[in-house]
C-alpha cells in the first residue's frame, strides 16, 4: 500500500485546513492508528493528534479544540484531520505516520501554507496644481503573505514606482503613482488594484483626481460695438473662465465706481438702459484658491444722434 497526501495545503487565514492522509492499501489491510505531528526543520516534532481505530481521536493539549476528524461517514483508511481556524503560526511542515496491519508503518509529509489576504489602503499625494512638474498623485500600500501585487488602473498618463518591505511572516508593498498635473486629468479615476492568492477577486480602491487650475479670463458681450448705444436695454457683459476649484467672479470699473443701476450677478454684469455714463473700462477679476486672472474691456456707449449728425456732416463735406 501507499499513503496519499498533498505536497502543499493552502488555506486562507482564519479558515479550516484539511490535512489529508489516506492509506491506499491492498484488500484486507487495516489501519490501526494515525499519528499527526508538526515537524519543522531545526525543531523537534510536536504532536498534534493520534487517531486510533478503536479508541478514537486524542488531541494534544497544544491543539485542544482545534483538531478534528472528518465528519462521518469515514473511510477507516482515511487518517485526515481538520485544523480549525488556521493562523500564520500554523504555517510549516506536518507529518502523518500510519500504522497498518499487516503491512507495517508508512509516513508522509505536507506543507501547510497560510495565506494572509491584504487590506489595502490608498493615500492621496499633495494637492495637484497645473504647472507643477512630476508630482505624487497617490500611494497604495498592501501587506499580506505572500507579498501582494499592487498595480494601477487609469487612463491618466503617469509613472509608477514600487517598493517592498519584508516582515517576519508577511511583506508590505507600496506603489506610488506620479504624474504631471494638467486640467484634463480633473475628475479622472485613479484605481489601485491589489492581487493576492488569498483574495477571490482583486481589491480595487479608486481615487478621483483633482487638479487645481485657472484658465485665462475673457469677456463676451462686446462682439458688436454698434449694439452699445444709448437707450439699449438688456445689455450685459459675461466673464468667461473655468477652474478647479470653481472660481469666483468680481467686476470693477477701472476709471471709477460701477455706475448706479449696474447689476453684478456672478460672472455677469447687467446694465440698465444704456447712457453715456456707462462708457468706461470694466475689469472682470476671476480667482480661486489656486490663482487669479483679470480681463478688461472698454465700453463706448454710442449716441445715435451724434452718429447720424456725423454722417450728415461727412456727406455734406463730400
Amino acid at each position: 500500500g501507499e499513503l496519499e497526501t498533498s505536497d502543499v495545503v493552502t488555506v486562507v487565514l482564519g479558515q479550516d485546513a484539511k490535512l489529508p492522509c489516506f492509506y491506499r492499501g491492498d484488500s484486507g489491510e487495516q489501519v490501526g492508528q494515525v499519528a499527526w505531528a508538526r515537524v519543522d526543520a531545526g525543531e523537534g516534532a510536536q504532536e498534534l493528534a493520534l487517531l486510533h481505530s478503536k479508541y478514537g481521536l486524542h488531541v494534544s493539549p497544544a491543539y485542544e479544540g482545534r483538531v478534528e476528524q472528518p465528519p462521518p461517514p469515514r473511510n477507516p483508511l482515511d487518517g485526515s484531520v481538520l485544523l480549525r481556524n488556521a493562523v500564520q503560526a500554523d504555517e510549516g511542515e506536518y507529518e502523518c505516520r500510519v500504522s497498518t496491519f499487516p503491512a507495517g508503518s508508512f509516513q508522509a509529509r505536507l506543507r501547510l501554507r497560510v495565506l494572509v489576504p491584504p487590506l489595502p489602503s490608498l493615500n492621496p499625494g499633495p494637492a495637484l496644481e497645473e504647472g507643477q512638474g512630476l508630482t505624487l498623485a497617490a500611494s497604495c500600500t498592501a501587506e499580506g503573505s505572500p507579498a501582494p501585487s499592487v498595480t494601477w488602473d487609469t487612463e491618466v498618463k503617469g509613472t509608477t514606482s514600487s517598493r517592498s518591505f519584508k516582515h517576519s511572516r508577511s511583506a508590505a508593498v507600496t506603489s506610488e503613482f506620479h504624474l504631471v498635473p494638467s486640467r484634463s486629468m480633473n475628475g479622472q479615476p485613479l484605481t489601485c488594484v491589489v492581487s493576492h492568492p488569498g483574495l477571490l477577486q482583486d481589491q480595487r480602491i479608486t481615487h478621483i483626481l483633482h487638479v487645481s487650475f485657472l484658465a485665462e479670463a475673457s469677456v463676451r458681450g462686446l462682439e458688436d460695438q454698434n449694439l452699445w448705444h444709448i437707450g439699449r436695454e438688456g445689455a450685459m457683459l459675461k466673464c468667461l473662465s473655468e477652474g478647479q476649484p470653481p472660481p469666483s467672479y468680481n467686476w470693477t470699473r477701472l476709471d471709477g465706481p460701477l455706475p448706479s443701476g449696474v447689476r453684478v450677478d456672478g460672472d455677469t454684469l447687467g446694465f440698465p438702459p444704456l447712457t453715456t455714463e456707462h462708457s468706461g473700462i470694466y475689469v472682470c477679476h476671476v480667482s480661486n484658491e489656486f490663482s487669479s486672472r483679470d480681463s478688461q474691456v472698454t465700453v463706448d456707449v454710442l449716441d445715435p444722434q451724434e452718429d447720424s449728425g456725423k454722417q450728415v456732416d461727412l456727406v455734406s463735406a463730400s
Epitope: E4, S6, V9, L77
Partner: antibody, heavy 123, light 107 residues
Framework: QVQLQQPGAELVMPGASVKMSCKAS????????MHWVKQRPGQGLEWIGA????????SYNQKFKGKATLTVDESSSTAYMQLSSLTSEDSAVYYC?????????WGYGMDNWGQGTSVTVSS | DIQMTQTTSSLSASLGDRVTISCRAS??????LNWYQQKPDGTVKLLIY???RLHSGVPSRFSGSGSGTDYSLTISNLEQEDIATYFC?????????FGGGTKLEIK
C-alpha cells in the same frame, strides 16, 4: 458542470429487486463519495447510505442494511443502488447525491443531487 | 438516531419578507448542520453547510445560524423563486438524519 443523471422511473413487482443508476459527469468521480436518499410521497428525506467511490468502502443506515446494496463502476463514473425484496413501503423517489469529502475539501453537505428515480412497487 | 425537528411544517409569507425556519436536534451536533431546498418539481439543492457557510452560487439573502441543538435558516428578502420546502440535516453522527421539512408558501 457537475451532473448526476438518474432514470426517471422504475416499475417493479413486489418481492423483486431493482438496480438504479446514477451517472456522474463534470468532475473526477473517484474524488467524491456518493450518498443515497429516500423520499416517500409527501414525506421527508431519509439517508440510506454512502459509498467512497475511490475504494468502494460503504457506510449504511442500519435501517437499510440488507435492503440496499451500493456499488460503483469507476470506468463509467456510475454509482448504483440495488434494492431487494421490494414491498409497497419501498415505493419512493430515490436520490443520489455527491458529497464533497476530497483530498482538499471537507465533507459537509451533499452539494449536488440527481433528479431522483421514482420507484413504484406494484403487481 | 438523532432526531431532527422542524416544528413549523408550513409557513406563509409575503414577497420581501424576512423568513426564519428553525430546526432542533435531539442532541448536540457540533454545528454539522446543513440546509437544503427542494423545489416543487423535486429538485434538491444545498444552501447552507456547517451551520452558516453559504454554498457557492446561493444568493446572499440566505443565511444560517445556531449551535448545540438549535439552528435556523433565514431568508432576508423573500423572492418568488424561494417558494420550496426546506430541510435541515445533521452530519455529526451516523445515520445522517433530516428534519421533516418546512414548506414555504406565498401569502
Amino acid at each position: 458542470q457537475v451532473q448526476l443523471q438518474q432514470p426517471g422511473a422504475e416499475l417493479v413487482m413486489p418481492g423483486a429487486s431493482v438496480k438504479m443508476s446514477c451517472k456522474a459527469s463534470g468532475y473526477t468521480f473517484t474524488d467524491y463519495w456518493m450518498h443515497w436518499v429516500k423520499q416517500r410521497p409527501g414525506q421527508g428525506l431519509e439517508w440510506i447510505g454512502a459509498i467512497d467511490t475511490s475504494d468502494s468502502y460503504t457506510s449504511y443506515n442500519q435501517k437499510f442494511k440488507g435492503k440496499a446494496t451500493l456499488t460503483v463502476d469507476e470506468s463509467s463514473s456510475t454509482a448504483y443502488m440495488q434494492l431487494s425484496s421490494l414491498t409497497s413501503e419501498d415505493s419512493a423517489v430515490y436520490y443520489c447525491a455527491r458529497w464533497g469529502s476530497t483530498m482538499i475539501t471537507w465533507g459537509y453537505g451533499m452539494d449536488n443531487w440527481g433528479q431522483g428515480t421514482s420507484v413504484t412497487v406494484s403487481s | 438516531d438523532i432526531q431532527m425537528t422542524q416544528t413549523t411544517s408550513s409557513l406563509s409569507a409575503s414577497l420581501g419578507d424576512r423568513v426564519t425556519i428553525s430546526c432542533r436536534a435531539s442532541q448536540d451536533i457540533n454545528n454539522y448542520l446543513n440546509w437544503y431546498q427542494q423545489k416543487p418539481d423535486g429538485t434538491v439543492k444545498l444552501l447552507i453547510y456547517y451551520t452558516s457557510r453559504l454554498h457557492s452560487g446561493v444568493p446572499s439573502r440566505f443565511s444560517g445560524s445556531g449551535s448545540g441543538t438549535d439552528y435556523s435558516l433565514t431568508i432576508s428578502n423573500l423572492e418568488q423563486e424561494d417558494i420550496a420546502t426546506y430541510f435541515c440535516q445533521q452530519g455529526n453522527t451516523l445515520p445522517w438524519t433530516f428534519g421533516g421539512g418546512t414548506k414555504l408558501e406565498i401569502k
